[in-house]
């Protein structure tokens, strides 16, 4: 960053999107700012306009191509700059040499569905979205189940240490409403972080069979 009160953080979704957030104390909300991407070994440059997301932070997505196109590799370095307009001039507010596969955050898993539900268990599957083929099977997942009377923050995390796009939830209560979420993370990358949580999937366990007299 150009000065100590500025923070510029970007993540690559592994395909064709770099999402950036820039925070700057004392910056004006109505200032026009751009993130400028300059790859070291590609023939394209890309910009996106930073839009305010809070009092002192701005965000935008560098869309590098169609969602599933592989626009960068592990050897790419992209110079990312925050440029803000000051009158008729543009001033560089922050800069970083961005290594995309060291700063990964995938898209949230999608297409969650109940494969099979019983009284005490439920089998759920999902799909990963816009994830690079470079990862092969080197992904891990975290999942959580929301039980009645609890919050998401209280839900214990279940870890899947392999590329497994399903889970069998057990020891559930019959005839009870639950919600389920999952997130994904590549094993690669020093600054890689978890994807956002998926949209919650609501499901209900089957009622217990009535006992015979």
């Amino acid at each position: 960053a150009v000065n100590g009160t500025s923070r510029f953080t970007c993540f690559y979704n592994s395909r064709a999107n770099i999402s950036c957030v820039w925070s700057q104390d004392g910056a004006l909300q109505d200032t026009s700012c751009q993130v400028h991407a300059w790859p070291d070994r590609r023939r394209w440059n890309q910009t996106c306009e930073l839009l305010p997301v809070s009092q002192a932070s701005w965000a935008c997505n560098l869309i590098l191509g169609t969602p599933d196109s592989q626009k960068l590799t592990a050897v790419d370095i992209v110079t990312l700059r925050v440029m803000c307009r000051e009158g008729v001039r543009w001033r560089m507010m922050a800069i970083q040499d961005f290594k995309p596969f060291e700063n990964l955050r995938l898209m949230a898993p999608i297409s969650l569905q109940v494969v099979h539900v019983e009284t005490h268990r439920c089998n759920i599957s999902w799909k990963i979205s816009q994830a690079s083929h470079y990862f092969e099977r080197h992904l891990e997942f975290e999942a959580r189940t929301l039980s009645p009377g609890h919050t998401w923050e209280e839900a214990p995390l279940m870890t899947l240490k392999q590329k497994q796009e399903w889970i069998c939830l057990e020891t559930l209560t019959p005839d009870t409403q639950y919600e389920f979420q999952v997130r994904v993370k590549p094993l690669q990358g020093e600054f890689t972080t978890w994807s956002p949580w998926s949209q919650p999937l609501a499901f209900r366990t089957k009622p217990a069979a009535l006992g015979k007299d």
């Epitope: 026009s32 751009q34 400028h36 394209w44 440059n45 890309q46 910009t47 306009e49 869309i63 191509g65």
Partner: nanobody, 123 residues
Framework: QVQLVESGGGLVQAGGSLRLSCAVS????????MAWFRQAPGKEREFVAS????????DYVHSVKGRFTVSRDNAKNTVYLQMNNLKPEDTAVYYC????????????????WGQGTQVTVSS
């Protein structure tokens, strides 16, 4: 590669209005800063207006400020130029331009271009 098709040009009297449209296909529209340029007979192509990927920020050549409005509809992959209070000196072929780099949009050789639409303003 992105393709641009302009429409909406025509003959109008001084003081009248026209709305130009530029339909974009072949790539992700929101990647692009979009601009309008114009070229009058015997003159060089000149920048008229631009709009950022989000549509939040616009820029105009001084001679059209207050009369022209550039906008975009990211759902329809279209950029517009609303031209009011037209003057005879606005007569030109109007071109739509696209560039993934905001800082290159005024550079003639860096842009992708449409085929142009003729605007004629009679006095």
């Amino acid at each position: 590669q992105v393709q641009l098709v302009e429409s909406g040009g025509g003959l109008v009297q001084a003081g009248g209005s026209l709305r130009l449209s530029c339909a974009v296909s072949g790539d992700v529209f929101v990647r692009y800063t979009m601009a309008w340029f114009r070229q009058a007979p015997g003159k060089e192509r000149e920048f008229v207006a631009s709009v950022t990927d989000s549509g939040r920020t616009t820029d105009y050549v001084h001679s059209v400020k207050g009369r022209f409005t550039v906008s975009r509809d990211n759902a329809k992959n279209t950029v517009y130029l609303q031209m009011n209070n037209l003057k005879p000196e606005d007569t030109a072929v109007y071109y739509c331009a696209a560039n993934t780099d905001y800082f290159q949009i005024k550079s003639l050789d860096a842009n992708t271009w449409g085929q142009g639409t003729q605007v004629t303003v009679s006095s």
